[in-house]
Interface confidence: medium
């Protein structure tokens, strides 16, 4: 069966300077390939976090994704700023051998509202 990516929150509100968690789980780790978080859609979408080892300031994974069979790819964004407002998507990719990774499934998106402190 096809992997399913779930983002249960439709929206979260967070005060500027605080941190927030964006929840995402998958039903399967197959096919092999990374999970990435983006803000926005289409040409304007911005890579926010990738579960592939790179360092992303202010953002970290919530659960230990190195553990076998971990299906939780939630992230915590700390010190939120107004520029962080937008819709965040958790996206599953299939790893390509020579070609680029292929996007196979996206969560429904979580809108982040940033409130003035």
């Amino acid at each position: 069966t096809e992997v399913k990516v779930t983002q249960p929150e439709k929206s979260v509100s967070v005060a500027a300077g605080d941190s927030t968690i964006l929840n995402c789980t998958v039903t399967s780790l197959l096919p092999v390939g990374p999970i990435r978080w983006y803000r926005g859609v289409g040409q304007s979408r911005l890579l926010i976090y990738s579960f592939t080892g790179e360092h992303f300031p202010r953002i970290r994974n919530v659960s230990d994704t190195t553990k076998r069979n971990n299906m939780d790819f939630s992230i915590r964004i700390s010190n939120v700023t107004p520029e962080d407002a937008g819709t965040y998507y958790c996206v599953k990719f299939q790893r390509g051998s020579s070609e680029p990774d292929t996007e196979i499934q996206s969560g429904g998106g979580t809108e982040v509202y940033v409130l003035a402190k």
Epitope: K4, T6, P8, K10, S11
Partner: antibody, heavy 119, light 108 residues
Framework: EVQLVESGGGVVQPGRSLRLSCAAS????????VNWVRQAPGKGLEWVSL????????YYADSVKGRFTISRDNSKNTLYLQMNSLRAEDTAVYYC????????????WGQGTLVTVSS | ETVLTQSPGTLSLSPGERATLSCRAS??????LAWYQQKPGQAPRLLIY???SRATGIPDRFSGSGSGTEFTLTISSLQSEDFAVYYC??????????FGGGTKVEIK
């Protein structure tokens, strides 16, 4: 106070059409996703369809896909359900339900309107 | 699609007794579960969300617990107005949103 008032129900023959309306008041209608949920006589609740606040995102239950169309007019604070090719198994009370703004559970419901499909 | 199974189908109890209703999910829904009460001829009313948080205006004799696939709604001391049908609903999975089949709490 949130109010959801359904109308448009009635008796209709199989294969015919009907349009339900749900008039909303007491909240910023365009900011909320709204749903239709139905209940056949003596049975449980069955989710039918959902439409996002902007109208851009729509989902249907498999049982009504291709026959029912959900829509909304935010200028009139009204939700609609166009029901075509009606079947006996569509007989139910149809409720309009407002979702919570963060999650997909229902914090406000209308009183319901009865649709009876019978020849 | 996540299937919710409620048990028992009917619970016959007397006023003042404790009612324990069960809802089991076919796959984990974490704590994304709501409970509703429905009286004859009325629309459902939200009781519990997030598996254990009471909705506004709901008396504290109603409590919810559980996570993952096993959930419980408890009414600590049944009042006459509590005799009704109770439904659980998961909102973790993407639509279709699903309800349990309901548990009727009736007067013994």
């Amino acid at each position: 106070e949130v109010q959801l008032v359904e109308s448009g129900g009635g008796v209709v023959q199989p294969g015919r059409s009907l349009r339900l309306s749900c008039a909303a008041s007491g909240f910023t209608f365009s900011s909320y996703d709204v749903n239709w949920v139905r209940q056949a006589p003596g049975k449980g609740l069955e989710w039918v369809s959902l439409i996002s606040g902007s109208g851009e995102i729509i989902y249907y239950a498999d049982s009504v896909k291709g026959r029912f169309t959900i829509s909304r007019d935010n200028s009139k604070n009204t939700l609609y359900l166009q029901m075509n090719s009606l079947r006996a198994e569509d007989t139910a009370v149809y409720y309009c339900a407002k979702e919570n703004n963060r999650y997909r559970f229902f914090d406000d419901w209308g009183q319901g309107t009865l649709v009876t499909v019978s020849s | 699609e996540t299937v919710l199974t409620q048990s028992p189908g009917t619970l016959s109890l007397s006023p003042g007794e404790r009612a324990t209703l069960s809802c089991r999910a076919s796959q984990s829904v974490y704590t994304y579960l709501a409970w509703y009460q429905q009286k004859p001829g009325q629309a459902p009313r939200l009781l519990i969300y997030g598996a254990s948080s009471r909705a506004t205006g709901i008396p504290d004799r109603f409590s919810g617990s559980g996570s993952g696939t096993e959930f419980t709604l408890t009414i600590s001391s049944l009042q006459s107005e509590d005799f009704a049908v109770y439904y659980c609903q998961q909102y973790y999975d993407r639509p279709p949103l699903t309800f349990g089949g309901g548990t009727k709490v009736e007067i013994k």
